[in-house]
């Protein structure tokens, strides 16, 4: 879903734009928010659906969202629920199954109107060890040619991490991709509990810096209703 994030902060290799240099590991995937990864995920059936406690959509798989299991139920008790199919009611994009988004309270197909359509480069993305690929989408937003002469500073638009200055990676933020700092110790990072539960998200983070890995925050292990925030920690 829109809120799902790349597996283990693996923001990996992007093809170059025409005539450009290939990105190095650390480049971010790009697609318009709501244009979802269409292939590879096997949807769970009700039979094998195992409730998983959560605090945020990000903790659930691409075919799930986080909510209270009962209408008007205790907000403190939330689990990963199966995503809602087309024409079902919704409150936000994450509730809708891959290939759909929430419009006027109803899940609709994202290919009906090129949702939020600002995406001209075609992107193929390798996710961690999965080697799943993201189908290409086309993007209207182009970059100033100046980008290729000087390295992008923090917050400037980019296509891949090689466009950014040292210590920065190219990651989605709101409606485009910008150069963001590589994460330091203690900073919030993104990691999925299930291998393969990756997708596109609107606020990507860079990977953790050298000697650090993205792990669940220590003081969050005990708290049953915690957000399960992950932070960059020493190996």
């Amino acid at each position: 879903t829109l809120n799902s994030v790349l597996n283990s902060n693996a923001i990996k290799n992007l093809p170059p734009p025409l005539g450009g240099a290939a990105g190095h590991p650390g480049s971010a995937v790009s697609a318009a928010p709501g244009i979802l990864y269409p292939g590879g995920n096997k949807y769970q059936t009700i039979d094998n659906y195992q409730p998983y406690p959560c605090a945020e959509d990000e903790e659930c798989g691409t075919d799930e969202y986080c909510a209270s299991p009962t209408r008007g139920g205790d907000a403190g008790v939330q689990i990963c629920l199966a995503c809602r199919k087309r024409r079902k009611r919704c409150m936000r994009h994450a509730m809708c199954c891959p290939g759909n988004y929430c419009k006027n309270g109803i899940c609709v197909s994202s290919d009906q109107n090129n949702f939020r359509g600002e995406i001209e480069e075609t992107i193929t993305e390798s996710f961690g060890n999965d080697h799943s690929t993201l189908d290409g989408y086309s993007r209207r937003t182009t970059l100033s040619s100046k980008m290729y002469h000087s390295k992008g500073q923090e917050g400037s638009v980019c296509l891949r991490s090689s466009d950014c200055a040292t210590g920065l990676c190219c990651a989605r933020h709101f409606w485009s991709k910008i150069c963001k700092p590589v994460l330091k110790e203690g900073q919030v990072c993104t990691k999925h509990r299930r291998k393969g539960s990756h997708g596109l998200e609107i606020f990507q983070r860079c990977y953790c810096g050298e000697g650090l890995s993205c792990r669940i925050q220590k003081d969050h292990h005990q708290a049953s209703n915690s957000s399960r925030l992950h932070t960059c920690q020493r190996h």
Epitope: A67, S144, E154, S156, W175, I178, Q187
Partner: antibody, heavy 116, light 112 residues
């Protein structure tokens, strides 16, 4: 250093129009998304609009949709906000902000007063 | 108008720690591990203090820290100083309207 200077504010009657400008310097203007954020007297911040680095994408708050138009001229390092059909509730200080990693640099603002 | 909910005012003595909360819904703050905080002194432009939940831009004191749990984000200021007296705003993203959303603001008073 990054500098953003707004101009064009003033007193205008309800239903009138005004065009705000924001002159940017100290950074590669054409590489950043830019926003307008406003603040009514004694009130909180309200996001108004954002424009992509190459002008291909624009987004607006529901409260100004259809009345305000954001634009930019990268050759002049200038951001604009064309405000039409102004209402009393549009009275505010209008800030131009660089939308890098969020609103990382702001101008000092220009006051727009809509009153008869 | 969609807005994130913040307490109108918070106060503390110099040297103390204070926390400002910012509560949203599952469609804005709760749906994303993303929130920013701004400081605004009277008559001045806002200044970015925290982004992406707990990241400080360069030049911002490490006395400022951010966190988030569920639908609520928090800004903590430790070792309170007189110059911290200002208005503080949280900011996030609202997916139904695909727009930026701010909290109503919290006035921080540093006592005596």
């Amino acid at each position: 250093q990054v500098q953003l200077v707004e101009s064009g504010g003033g007193l205008v009657q309800p239903g009138g129009s005004l065009r705000l400008s924001c002159a940017a310097s100290g950074f590669t203007f054409s590489s950043y998304w830019m926003s307008w954020v406003r603040q009514a007297p004694g009130k909180g911040l309200e996001w108004v609009s954002v424009i992509s680095s190459d002008s291909s994408s624009t987004y607006y708050a529901d409260s100004v949709k259809g009345r305000f138009t954001i634009s930019r001229d990268n050759s002049k390092n200038t951001l604009y906000l064309q405000m039409n059909s102004l209402r009393a509730e549009d009275t505010a200080v209008y800030y131009c902000a660089r939308h890098g990693i969020d609103f990382d640099h702001w101008g000092q603002g220009t006051l727009v007063t809509v009153s008869s | 108008d969609i807005a994130l909910t913040q307490p109108a005012s918070v106060s503390g003595s110099p040297g103390q720690s204070i926390t400002i909360s910012c509560t949203g819904t599952s469609s804005d703050l709760g749906g994303y591990n993303y929130v920013s905080w701004y400081q605004q002194h009277p008559g001045k432009a806002p200044k970015l203090m925290i982004y992406d939940v707990n990241n400080r831009p360069s030049g911002v004191s490490n006395r400022f820290s951010g966190s988030k749990s569920g639908n609520t984000a928090s800004l903590t200021i430790s070792g309170l100083q007189a110059e911290d007296e200002a208005d503080y705003y949280c900011q996030s993203y609202d997916s139904p309207t695909d727009s930026v959303v701010f909290g109503g603001g919290t006035k921080l008073t540093v006592l005596g």
